[in-house]
């Protein structure tokens, strides 16, 4: 009656185009056009004494320009935020994060591997202190960098004795087919190992650990 | 009752402090104070007909405020650029990159692990086509994520028969104590393996590979 | 697999990537959208106000033949 | 470490990457500093201009006892 | 390795992270919101000034029958 | 799989992380420089307007001896 034991698998582990809003209007054109169309009476009645009405035209022109400029600036930032793209070559280049300084960023999630061995509770506290949580595996596609992680590290998966299920720190249940749980040891906590394997371990046993911060 | 045991798979894979310039001035206070102090004659001479001089005081106030605002905004951006920090809690949060989409970003370097097995030349060409190069190991500190990489992957290290040295694609010589070179087979290319080990391999042998893009 | 043919020289090195970046904002999309909208509205208000302010009014002289200086038009 | 057997050719090297990155977006520090300075100067010009424009001038009434409407002061 | 004493309960879970971000720049939400608001206020001040400047007022002629040109109203 | 030894209590679970983030600036150097320049031009337009508005002009009284109030100069 064979245990299903994971064999090694061959594995593996991208700017908003700014449509340059061609503001092809010369300043003279702009102000002249506005004066001709919008301020004919003002022009004839108040130009020589520089009344407030005449001044209004200038303000209108200036503010109209400022309106276009500000909308353009904010739109650029907004569109970039919306599409998560950089307007530079290559178009597939983008920033990742934000993450704590010197953490690994992959598909807008942040990861850090910690060398020191701690039990599960200490590992969890360590991640918490850095505004993160222990590793949660939620997608083989979005987290395929985990395929090539060596060794065994605490993750945020715990066993719930009342219903026998495995549950993440956030209360969500472990999705089927995400991890191969290998129960060769007794415990209520789990270690992550390469190729999406989870090894059950006594929560009090010291192990290295992986912290994760989800930004998306 | 079978134990679920995973089989291994071979794998390839930042405010500018805004000293809130307490603009705690009601509009009326603001304009009144400026009129009293800055425009006494304007007040006495031109209030009732709302001359341009009176209007000027308002413009001055408004533009003074705008000056403060704009300098603050730009200063914040400038300081951020200067110190490479996030103005949010924690101060150590930052973005990483830019990197090609869906690459791993760590300490502003970009990495990607590729599943498909290619010889060294093909691997190099693949990285080149993505504006990157094969992995270059230049610092155990800046690249400590490489410690936990499973399996064996082509990197940009080649042997120069004329002087017997190991050299990176960019022509730089392999620094001592960076990699432990292990000559498992006869060859002029090297595979990267966990814990900063380099395994000599024939350049024509197909292997998975790691591409890298340095942004710093 | 065959070994590629002879190579006569060492690498001609690529100048690489030269993007620069450090640190990045903290605005959510809804907030950013709100800010853009607010700024747009404020600017339009200004433009609208100056048009209204610049609008010619009927002269009181048209009513009684007298010139009232700094008096509101009564038409 | 032993030296691997001779090879008749070396790999043709990829041009590599050697970019540099600092700042957010794609502004260099000098450029950003220049932009800040330019905006500050423009704003100060505006403030200065309105103060000059708002500066009281000697009334022509003090000269000849007559009120000149919309005439430049002659003192 | 010695095994730490048994634990009687399951882990007390951490509240996680909830930072949000989009775009570039380095302004915190409160600051950026304040700056935008301040800019809006500055713009509105201009609007207010335009309205004040353009607003017709009661003529001082109604007081003493004389026309005071460019004199403050005494009422 | 057998159920590991009983535990006396269950975790107080955290709702996880819900931050969101996307992208870092999207303005190229030429574009951003252009926008800043355009803003500067807008500001200078205002300055120009103020100067024009404050500039003393020749009185129309010098033309025909009459005072034309709020009438365009005819010379």
């Amino acid at each position: 009656m064979g245990w299903i034991r994971g064999r090694r698998s061959r594995h593996s582990w991208e700017m908003s185009e700014f449509h340059n809003y061609n503001l092809d209007l010369k300043k003279s054109d702009f102000s002249t056009r506005w004066q001709k169309q919008r301020c004919p009476v003002v022009k004839s009645k108040c130009r020589e004494n520089a009344s407030p009405f005449f001044f209004c035209c200038f303000i209108a022109v200036a503010m109209g320009i400022r309106f276009i400029i500000m909308v353009t600036i904010w739109s650029a930032v907004f569109l970039n935020s919306l599409f998560n793209q950089e307007v530079q070559i290559p178009l597939t280049e983008s920033y990742c994060g934000p993450c704590p300084k010197n953490w690994i960023c992959y598909k807008n999630n942040c990861y850090q591997f910690f060398d020191e061995s701690k039990n599960w509770y200490e590992s969890q506290a360590s991640c918490m202190s850095q505004n993160a949580s222990l590793l949660k595996v939620y997608s083989k596609e979005d987290q395929d960098l985990l395929k090539l992680v060596k060794s065994y590290h605490w993750m945020g998966l715990v066993h719930i004795p009342t219903n026998g299920s495995w549950q993440w720190e956030d209360g969500s249940i472990l999705s089927p087919n995400l991890l191969t749980i290998i129960e060769m040891q007794k415990g209520d906590c789990a270690l992550y190992a390469s190729s999406f394997k989870g090894y059950i371990e006594n929560c009090s046993t010291p192990n290295t650990y992986i912290c994760m911060q989800r930004t998306v | 009752m079978g134990w679920i045991r995973g089989r291994r798979s071979r794998h390839s894979w930042e405010m500018s402090e805004f000293h809130n310039y307490n603009l705690d001035l009601k509009k009326s206070d603001f304009s009144t104070r400026w009129q009293k102090q800055r425009c006494p004659v304007v007040k006495s001479k031109c209030r009732e007909n709302a001359s341009p001089f009176f209007f000027c005081c308002f413009i001055a106030v408004a533009m003074g405020i705008r000056f403060i605002i704009m300098v603050t905004i730009w200063s914040a951006v400038f300081l951020n650029s200067l110190f490479n920090q996030e103005v949010q809690i924690p101060l150590t949060e930052s973005y990483c990159g830019p990197c090609p989409k869906n690459w791993i970003c760590y300490k502003n370097n970009c990495y990607q692990f590729f599943d498909e097995s290619k010889n060294w030349y093909e691997s190099q060409a693949s990285c080149m086509s993505q504006n990157a190069s094969l992995l270059k190991v230049y610092s155990k500190e800046d690249q400590d994520l490489l410690k936990l990489v499973k399996s064996y992957h082509w990197m940009g290290l080649v042997h120069i028969p004329t002087n017997g040295s190991w050299q990176w694609e960019d022509g730089s010589i392999l620094s001592p104590n960076l990699l432990t070179i292990i000559e498992m087979q006869k060859g002029d290319c090297a595979l990267y393996a966990s814990s900063f080990k380099g395994y000599i391999e024939n350049c024509s042998t197909p292997n998975t590979y790691i591409c890298m893009q340095r942004t710093v | 697999q065959t070994t590629p043919g002879e190579r006569s020289s060492l690498p001609a090195f690529y100048p690489g990537t030269s993007g620069s970046c450090s640190g990045c904002g903290s605005l959510s999309l809804p907030l950013l959208a709100g800010l853009v909208a607010a700024d747009a509205v404020a600017s339009l208000l200004i433009v609208g106000a100056v048009f209204l302010c610049a609008r010619p009014r009927r002269s009181p002289a048209q009513e009684d033949g007298k010139v009232y200086i700094n008096m509101p038009g009564r038409g | 470490q032993t030296t691997p057997g001779e090879r008749s050719s070396l790999p043709a090297f990829y041009p590599g990457t050697s970019g540099s990155c600092s700042g957010c977006g794609s502004l260099s520090l000098p450029l950003l500093a220049g932009l800040v300075a330019a905006d500050a100067v423009a704003s100060l010009l505006i403030v200065g201009a309105v103060f000059l424009c708002a500066r009281p001038r000697r009334s022509p009434a003090q000269e000849d006892g007559k009120v000149y409407i919309n005439m430049p002061g002659r003192g | 390795q010695t095994t730490p004493g048994e634990r009687s309960s399951l882990p007390a879970f951490y509240p996680g992270t909830s930072g949000s971000c989009s775009g570039c720049g380095s302004l915190s939400l409160p600051l950026l919101a304040g700056l935008v608001a301040a800019d809006a206020v500055a713009s509105l001040l201009i609007v207010g000034a335009v309205f004040l400047c353009a607003r017709p007022r009661r003529s001082p002629a109604q007081e003493d029958g004389k026309v005071y040109i460019n004199m403050p109203g005494r009422g | 799989q057998t159920t590991p030894g009983e535990r006396s209590s269950l975790p107080a679970f955290y709702p996880g992380t819900s931050g969101s983030c996307s992208g870092c600036g999207s303005l190229s150097l030429p574009l951003l420089a252009g926008l800043v320049a355009a803003d500067a031009v807008a500001s200078l337009l205002i300055v120009g307007a103020v100067f024009l508005c404050a500039r003393p002009r020749r009185s129309p009284a010098q033309e025909d001896g009459k005072v034309y109030i709020n009438m365009p100069g005819r010379g």
Epitope: G187, A193 | M1, R7, R8 | - | - | Q1 | -
Partner: antibody, heavy 118, light 108 residues
């Protein structure tokens, strides 16, 4: 510190029986699987048997199936190997070892010698 | 049952690098573990999961696993490294732990 101490070895005639014990300390015995591995004089290591942490699963080498029985008493932090129908080829030093993830043996005892001879 | 083939002996001069191979069909698909056994002593785990070193094991010990051969490498060999070295895998088909025949390392 993890300690594994084997006992119960000795000389026994072919066909005889012997019970080996392994006392464990320094770790949570009830949480880990345990192995018996033997080494004939001048020979290499040969895996003999494995028992899961809760005793629910036991595995044996083909050469000892039906003759040897592995068991454990978690309350006593001890595991056992009951050897029946002993043969001359069973003569070896028997090592007790702690399992890790069902893959490798991370701690070993010093061994106890079992001699099957007439 | 997989057969792990090891040479009975390997000799190396002090300061040199010793390489002890362990052959087996598709061995690269399995985790290979290595044990050192000095005369009269119990075996000690020196490498697990192909190339991981337990705490306390010198950095001179390296493991690799590729193709049909796993290799234990010991750089800058010292006299104290003289011992028998065994490779081991878990046979998931037969639920057995399999050891190689062992290699005696001699430091010349």
């Amino acid at each position: 510190e993890v300690q594994l101490v084997e006992s119960g070895g000795g000389v026994v005639q072919p066909g005889g029986s012997l019970r080996l014990s392994c006392a464990a300390s320094g770790f949570t015995f009830s949480s880990y699987g345990m192995h018996w591995v033997r080494q004939a004089p001048g020979k290499g290591l040969e895996w003999v048997a494995f028992i899961r942490y809760d005793g629910s699963n036991k595995y044996y080498a083909d050469s000892v199936k039906g003759r040897f029985t592995i068991s454990r008493d978690n309350s006593k932090n001890t595991k056992y190997l009951q050897m029946n129908s002993l043969r001359a080829e069973d003569t070896a030093v028997y090592y007790c070892a702690k399992d890790r993830f069902g893959y490798y043996l991370d701690y070993w005892g010093q061994g106890t010698l079992v001699t099957v001879s007439s | 049952q997989p057969v792990l083939t090891q040479p009975s002996s390997v000799s190396v001069a002090p300061g040199e690098t010793a390489r002890i191979p362990c052959g087996g069909d598709d061995i690269e698909t399995k985790s290979v573990h290595w044990y050192q056994q000095k005369p009269g002593q119990a075996p000690v785990l020196v490498i697990y999961d192909d190339d991981d070193r337990p705490s306390g094991i010198p950095e001179r010990f390296f493991g690799s696993n590729s193709g049909n051969t796993a290799t234990l490498s010991i750089s800058r060999v010292e006299a104290g490294d003289e011992a028998d070295y065994y490779c081991q895998v878990w046979d998931d088909n037969n639920d057995e732990w399999v050891f190689g025949g062992g290699t005696q390392l001699t430091v010349l």
